[in-house]
């Protein structure tokens, strides 16, 4: 018959035959079961015992199939670096934060553990959009034919120009990328400096 | 140099009690596991129970479990075996072992008393 | 009764080789490794072997062990009278409740 997989288990070459729930322990030269997540190692295996689990305390986790022998501490989303809770922490899960809205990540560490401001678009610009949010800084793109944006803001967008003879009124003025076009009553005078190009 | 010397064997009436100890000296005796092992008369070796280092857990032979119960004194360097409701069958030399060390390569039976009779007798 | 099973008894001239084998199951040398001890008439118990193959300091190179599958064999060549002992091989099981298990017992005689 076959031996069984089964830990623990003697392993001369040192190598285990579940990798992600099993371990090689070199004192014993054995494979023994890491512990599931959501818990941690209270009581090490030996060639007569296999690993022995407990569950983390509350405000504690472990993420993966560990051999730990504690928990790791759940951490607030610190606003002080501009970053807020999505998910809250579980024993299986740490806290899950994004930036406060306007913010980017501007500090890596297999997370983001700073936000900062995102940077204004000026007028006739506005940020281009991205996959995640706060995953970078705004990169400001001009608005596209027919649009306007006329502040400076991180987050606002270009708008179309507005269609004058949509509202029953007539174009004073063209739009352009930082405003918008200047509509009027057809039946209103033009204004004195414009008086030379209308046509008789 | 590395000892273990057993005492308490004696000649005791079927369903009596009994306590066996066993001193060790020459290792750091609360950074290893200790065992029973019996060999009664004309038989072969036979495992009775395993100690924790730290006396938090045990395993016993399904032929003495809720009978004997395996202890230890860590500040005395002292294993017992106590022997509950004996029988017949319990009759044999009974050697005290070093285990498993708690933090070196793993070595398990590698010392030996040299043992102490008990005789299960009316 | 020992779920290890090992021949009663071999014999060997002196200066010969001779094996004796362990025969278990998957629950116990399948998935473990196997120790091998010496008893002489009147002594404790000797560690021979550990680990199905390695010795302790102070065992000579004429004893030594293998493992295959769910059996194990403990060989001595160059006997010597003072061979002359029970060997019992053993291992931890895990079938039901864990515990430590020994062979049977082989006899030794150097003729």
């Known amino acids: 018959s076959q031996p069984q997989a089964v830990p623990p288990y003697a392993s001369e070459n040192q190598t285990c035959r579940d990798q992600e729930k099993e371990y090689y322990e070199p004192q014993h030269r054995i494979c023994c079961s890491r512990c599931p997540p959501g818990t941690y190692v209270s009581a090490k295996c030996s060639r007569i015992r296999d690993t022995v689990c407990a569950t983390c305390a509350e405000n504690s986790y472990n993420e993966h199939w560990n051999y730990l022998t504690i928990c790791q501490l759940c951490r607030p989303c610190d606003p002080v670096m501009g970053l807020e809770e999505i998910a809250p922490c579980t024993s299986k899960r740490k806290t899950q934060c994004r930036c406060q809205p306007g913010m980017f990540c501007a500090a890596w560490a297999l997370e983001c553990t700073h936000c900062e401001l995102l940077s204004d678009c000026p007028p006739g610009t506005e940020a281009e959009l991205k996959d995640e949010v706060g995953k970078g800084n705004n990169h400001c793109v001009p608005c596209k034919a027919g649009h306007f944006q006329n502040t400076s803001s991180p987050s606002a967008r270009c708008q179309p120009h507005t269609r004058c003879e949509n509202q029953g009124l007539v174009e004073a003025a063209p739009g352009t990328a930082q405003s918008d076009t200047t509509c009027k009553n057809p039946l209103e005078p033009l204004p004195p400096e414009m008086s030379g190009t209308m046509l008789m | 140099q590395v000892q273990l010397v057993e005492s308490g064997g004696a000649v005791v009436q079927p369903g009596r009690s009994l306590r066996l100890s066993c001193a060790a000296s020459g290792f750091t005796f609360s950074s290893y596991g200790m065992h029973w092992v019996r060999q009664a008369p004309g038989k072969g070796l036979e495992w009775v129970a395993i100690?924790?280092?730290?006396?938090?857990?045990?395993y016993y032979a399904d032929s003495v479990k809720g009978r004997f119960t395996i202890s230890r004194d860590n500040s005395k360097n002292t294993l017992y075996l106590q022997m509950n409701s004996v029988r017949d069958e319990d009759t044999a030399l009974y050697y005290c072992?070093?285990?498993?060390?708690?933090?070196?390569?793993?070595?398990?039976?590698?010392?030996w008393g040299q043992g102490t009779t008990v005789t299960v007798s009316s | 009764q020992s779920v290890l099973t090992q021949p009663p008894s071999v014999s060997a001239a002196p200066g010969q080789k001779v094996t004796i084998s362990c025969s278990g199951s998957s629950s116990n040398i399948g998935k473990n490794y196997v120790s091998w001890y010496q008893h002489l008439p009147g002594t404790a118990p000797k560690l021979l072997i550990y680990?199905?193959?390695k010795r302790p300091s102070g065992i000579p190179d004429r004893f030594s062990g293998s493992k295959s599958g769910t059996s194990a064999t403990l060989g001595i060549t160059g006997l010597q009278t003072g061979d002359e002992a029970d060997y019992y091989c053993?291992?931890?099981?895990?079938?039901?409740?864990?515990?430590?298990?020994f062979g049977t017992g082989t006899k030794v005689t150097v003729l």
């Open positions: 100690i924790w280092y730290d006396g938090s857990d045990e």
């Open positions: 680990d199905n193959n």
């Open positions: 072992v070093r285990g498993d060390s708690e933090d070196f390569y793993y070595y398990d039976f590698d010392v």
């Open positions: 053993g291992t931890w099981d895990h079938s039901l409740s864990a515990s430590y298990v």
